[in-house]
Interface confidence: low
C-alpha cells in the first residue's frame, strides 16, 4: 500500500528508538570517516523531521523518498569534499544514480584504527551514565567498519551488548564477567559482517535469481515440511529484505524483516515445527531466533529424488516449459533432503543438474543421456568433504594457532603477491573454522566448514577487488560464487611468482613485542611467517617450523631478559642470520 | 507481575534531608541490581545511582556523590535512597527501577519502574 510519507510510515512502524538506531547505522555505513557526534546531530534532525511528518503526513518535503531525505542531509554537510574527496561527486546527481554512487564509495577496508574495548570500569561508568550514547557509540563503530552489516542484526547485537554491560556493571569483577561474554558478541557479529558481506556481494554481481537460489536452498534445509510455494514465498521475502539492506534502504529492510517473523509466527503450521519458542520473543530477538533456527525433522516418508527428477519421461517438457520453476522445484526437494550438505554443495549440484538438461534435451534419447546425472554428483559430493575431513584432522593435530599458521603458508603460497596483513587476516579466519565447525557432529561439519570458507573467501575477493595484484585470484574471484571454494583449493604454488629479497628489518622486533596481548603477538608472528614464504615461497615445512621454532624461542628469552632491548638489539641480527641459513 | 512501589518523597529546604524507599515484588529482588534514576521538571530522564544485588558494588552519579546514600534490605526487599544536603536542582521525581531483559536498544524502556515519588526543595 502506498504511503504519502515514507518515513512517517517507517518512524510509526520501527518506532522511535529502532528508527534512530537504523538511521545512525545508515549514516555510518555510508559517510565512514564522520566522528559520531557529526551523525547524532543528524540523527537527531531526521527524527525530528520524521516526528513532524507522523503529526502531519503532507507538511513540507514529507512526501519525499527517504533516500531524498538522507541523501540532502549528507551532501549539506560541511567540507564533505575535505573528507571524502570524489564521494562529494555524488552530490551533484539526482535520485536514484545519488544513491548508487554513494553505495559504490563505500570502503570495505576503512582507514580506522582498530576497535578498543574500553577498560572494564570505566566502560561500565559511560554505560551507566548514558546509556543511549554508549550504545549509540558502538552502533557507530560497527557499522562504519563493516559498512554492508545487516542493519537490523546489528541492533539486535547493540541488545546483547546492553545485556551484558547491566547484568555485568553491577558485579564486584566486572572484568570477569565481561571479557567472555563480550567476546562471545563479537565473534559472532564479525561472521555475521562476512556472511552478510557474501550476501551483498552475491547481490551486487549476480543479481536477485541467484540469492533467490541460495535462499531456497537454505530454507528448504531448515524448513523440509513446508511446500514448495510455501517455500518459494519466504525465498522471495528474504531476498527483497536483503536487497533492502545490501542497498541502504535500512528502514524499510528492518520494517520488512519484522513484518517476515510475523508472517512466519503466524504461519508455523506450514513452516516448521521448531518456531514456537522463537515466536515469544520481542521482535528483534524474533527475527534472529529465527534467522538462526534449527532444521525441523525431514519428513519420513519422502520417495527418491530419482522419481520426478530423473525416471519421469516429461523431465525435459516439464524443464523446457517452466525452467526456473522446475529448477527450483529440484534445489528444493534435493536441499530439504540434504541438511548436511553446504548451500553452496547444493546450489553446484543444481548447477550441474541444469546443464545436463541443457546438453541432453537437446539430443536424440535424452532419457538415456540424463539418466546417469545423479552418479554424476558423487565427484561433487566428495571433494567438500574430503576437504572437512583433511583439513579438520590437521586442525586436530595442530590446534588453532597452528591450523592457522598452515592456511597461511598454503594461501601465501597461493597467492604471494597478496598483501601481508589481507593473507593474514584471512588466514586467521580461515583458520577459525577448525574451531566453531570441527567440534560439530558429524552432520553439521560440511555446512559449516564450506558455508563459513566461501563467506571468508568473499571477504578476500572484495579485499582484493580494491588493489588487484594477484592473476590467479581475480580468475577464483572472478567466477561464479559457488564455484569460489574449489577454486581457491585448486590453487597450486604460484610458479610465476618472483620470490621477495630478504629484508632484515622484516624480521627485526623490539622489546614492545613483550607487552601485546597474546593476539597482538600471534599476528606479529604470523606477519613475519608469511614474509619467510615470500622470500622462499618453496620452503618445507621442516624449514619453516625451525625457522618458526627459533623465533618463537628468541622472543621468549628477549622478553625474559633484564635488559629486554639490549636482547633484543644483539640478538636480532643473530636470528636473522640463521633464518637465512635455514632457508637456504 | 512486577511491582516497584516508591515512598518518602516530600517537600525540604535547602540542605535538608530525606529517604526515599523502594518496595519491590513479583520478581527475584534479591539478584537483581536496582538503579535510582530521577526527571527534574521538563527534563528528561536522570541516571542518579546503581547497586548490586550483593550490594557490593555501588556507583554514583557526580552531582550527587557525597550527598546520597543507596543500600538494600534484600531480607525485606526493599531498596532505599538517603539523601542529605538537598539542594534546589535535586526537586524531580524520584524512580527506582530493575532491569528487563532488553525489548530495546540502550534506553530506560529496558528497566521495569514504579509509580514515583515527588522530592521538592525549595527555601
Known amino acids: 500500500e502506498a504511503h504519502k510519507s515514507e518515513i512517517a510510515h517507517r518512524f510509526k512502524d520501527l518506532g522511535e528508538q529502532h528508527f534512530k538506531g537504523l538511521v545512525l547505522i545508515a549514516f555510518s555505513q555510508y559517510l565512514q570517516k564522520c566522528p559520531y557526534e557529526e551523525h547524532i546531530k543528524l540523527v537527531q534532525e531526521v527524527t525530528d523531521f520524521a516526528k513532524t511528518c507522523v503529526a502531519d503526513e503532507n507538511a513540507e518535503n514529507c512526501d519525499k523518498s527517504i533516500h531524498t531525505l538522507f541523501g540532502d542531509k549528507l551532501c549539506a554537510i560541511p567540507k564533505l569534499r575535505d573528507n571524502y574527496g570524489e564521494l562529494a561527486d555524488c552530490c551533484a546527481k539526482q535520485e536514484p544514480e545519488r544513491n548508487e554512487c554513494f553505495l559504490q564509495h563505500k570502503d570495505d577496508n576503512p582507514n580506522l584504527p582498530p576497535f578498543q574495548r574500553p577498560e572494564a570500569e570505566a566502560m561500565c561508568t559511560s554505560f551507566q551514565e548514558n546509556p543511549t550514547s554508549f550504545l549509540g557509540h558502538y552502533l557507530h563503530e560497527v557499522a562504519r567498519r563493516h559498512p554492508y552489516f545487516y542493519a537490523p542484526e546489528l541492533l539486535y547485537y547493540a541488545e546483547k551488548y546492553n545485556e551484558v554491560l547491566t547484568q555485568c556493571c553491577t558485579e564486584s569483577d566486572k572484568a570477569a564477567c565481561l571479557t567472555p561474554k563480550l567476546d562471545a558478541v563479537k565473534e559472532k557479529a564479525l561472521v555475521a559482517a562476512v556472511r552478510q558481506r557474501m550476501k551483498c556481494s552475491s547481490m551486487q554481481r549476480f543479481g536477485e535469481r541467484a540469492f533467490k537460489a541460495w535462499a531456497v536452498a537454505r530454507m528448504s534445509q531448515r524448513f523440509p515440511n513446508a511446500e514448495f510455494a510455501e517455500i518459494t514465498k519466504l525465498a522471495t521475502d528474504v531476498t527483497k529484505i536483503n536487497k533492502e539492506c545490501c542497498h541502504g534502504d535500512l528502514l524499510e529492510c528492518a520494517d520488512d524483516r519484522a513484518e517476515l517473523a510475523k508472517y512466519m509466527c503466524e504461519n508455523q503450521a506450514t513452516i516448521s515445527s521448531k518456531l514456537q519458542a522463537c515466536c515469544d520473543k520481542p521482535v528483534l530477538q524474533k527475527s534472529q531466533c529465527l534467522a538462526e533456527i534449527e532444521h525441523d525433522n525431514i519428513p519420513a516418508d519422502l520417495p527418491s529424488i530419482a522419481a520426478d527428477f530423473v525416471e519421469d519421461k516429461e523431465v525435459c517438457k516439464n524443464y523446457a516449459e517452466a525452467k526456473d520453476v522446475f529448477l527450483g522445484t529440484f534445489l528444493y526437494e534435493y536441499s530439504r533432503r540434504h541438511p548436511d550438505y553446504s548451500v553452496s554443495l547444493l546450489l553446484r549440484l543444481a548447477k550441474k543438474y541444469e546443464a545436463t538438461l541443457e546438453k541432453c534435451c537437446a539430443e536424440g534419447d535424452p532419457p538415456a543421456c540424463y539418466g546417469t546425472v545423479l552418479a554424476e554428483f558423487q565427484p561433487l559430493v566428495e571433494e567438500p568433504k574430503n576437504l572437512v575431513k583433511t583439513n579438520c584432522e590437521l586442525y586436530e593435530k595442530l590446534g588453532e594457532y597452528g591450523f592457522q599458521n598452515a592456511v597461511l603458508v598454503r594461501y601465501t603460497q597461493k597467492a604471494p603477491q597478496v598483501s601481508t596483513p589481507t593473507l593474514v587476516e584471512a588466514a586467521r579466519n580461515l583458520g577459525r573454522v577448525g574451531t566453531k565447525c570441527c567440534t560439530l557432529p558429524e552432520a553439521q561439519r560440511l555446512p559449516c566448514v564450506e558455508d563459513y570458507l566461501s563467506a571468508i573467501l568473499n571477504r578476500l575477493c572484495v579485499l582484493h577487488e580494491k588493489t588487484p595484484v594477484s592473476e590467479k585470484v581475480t580468475k577464483c574471484c572472478s567466477g561464479s560464487l559457488v564455484e569460489r571454494r574449489p577454486c581457491f583449493s585448486a590453487l597450486t604454488v604460484d610458479e610465476t611468482y618472483v620470490p621477495k629479497e630478504f629484508k632484515a628489518e622484516t624480521f627485526t622486533f623490539h622489546s614492545d613485542i613483550c607487552t601485546l596481548p597474546d593476539k597482538e603477538k600471534q599476528i606479529k608472528k604470523q606477519t613475519a611467517l608469511a614474509e619467510l614464504v615470500k622470500h622462499k615461497p618453496k620452503a618445507t615445512e621442516d624449514q619453516l617450523k625451525t625457522v618458526m621454532g627459533d623465533f618463537a624461542q628468541f622472543v621468549d628469552k628477549c622478553c625474559k631478559a633484564a635488559d629486554k632491548d639490549n636482547c633484543f638489539a644483539t640478538e636480532g641480527p643473530n636470528l636473522v642470520a640463521r633464518s637465512k641459513e635455514a632457508l637456504a | 507481575e512486577v511491582q516497584l512501589v516508591e515512598s518518602g518523597g516530600g517537600e525540604v529546604q535547602p540542605g535538608g534531608s530525606l529517604r526515599l524507599s523502594c518496595a519491590a515484588s513479583g520478581f527475584a529482588f534479591s539478584t537483581s541490581g536496582m538503579v535510582w534514576v530521577r526527571q527534574a521538571p521538563g527534563k528528561g530522564l536522570e541516571w542518579v545511582s546503581t547497586?548490586?544485588?550483593?550490594?557490593?558494588?555501588?556507583r554514583y552519579a557526580e552531582s550527587v556523590k557525597g550527598r546520597f546514600t543507596i543500600s538494600r534490605d534484600n531480607a525485606k526487599n526493599t531498596l532505599y535512597l538517603q539523601m542529605n544536603s538537598l539542594r534546589a536542582e535535586d526537586t524531580a521525581v524520584y524512580y527506582c527501577a530493575t532491569y528487563r531483559a532488553g525489548s530495546r536498544i540502550g534506553s530506560y524502556e529496558d528497566y521495569y519502574w514504579g509509580q514515583g515519588t515527588l522530592v521538592t526543595v525549595k527555601p
Open positions: 547497586i548490586s544485588d550483593d550490594a557490593r558494588i555501588i
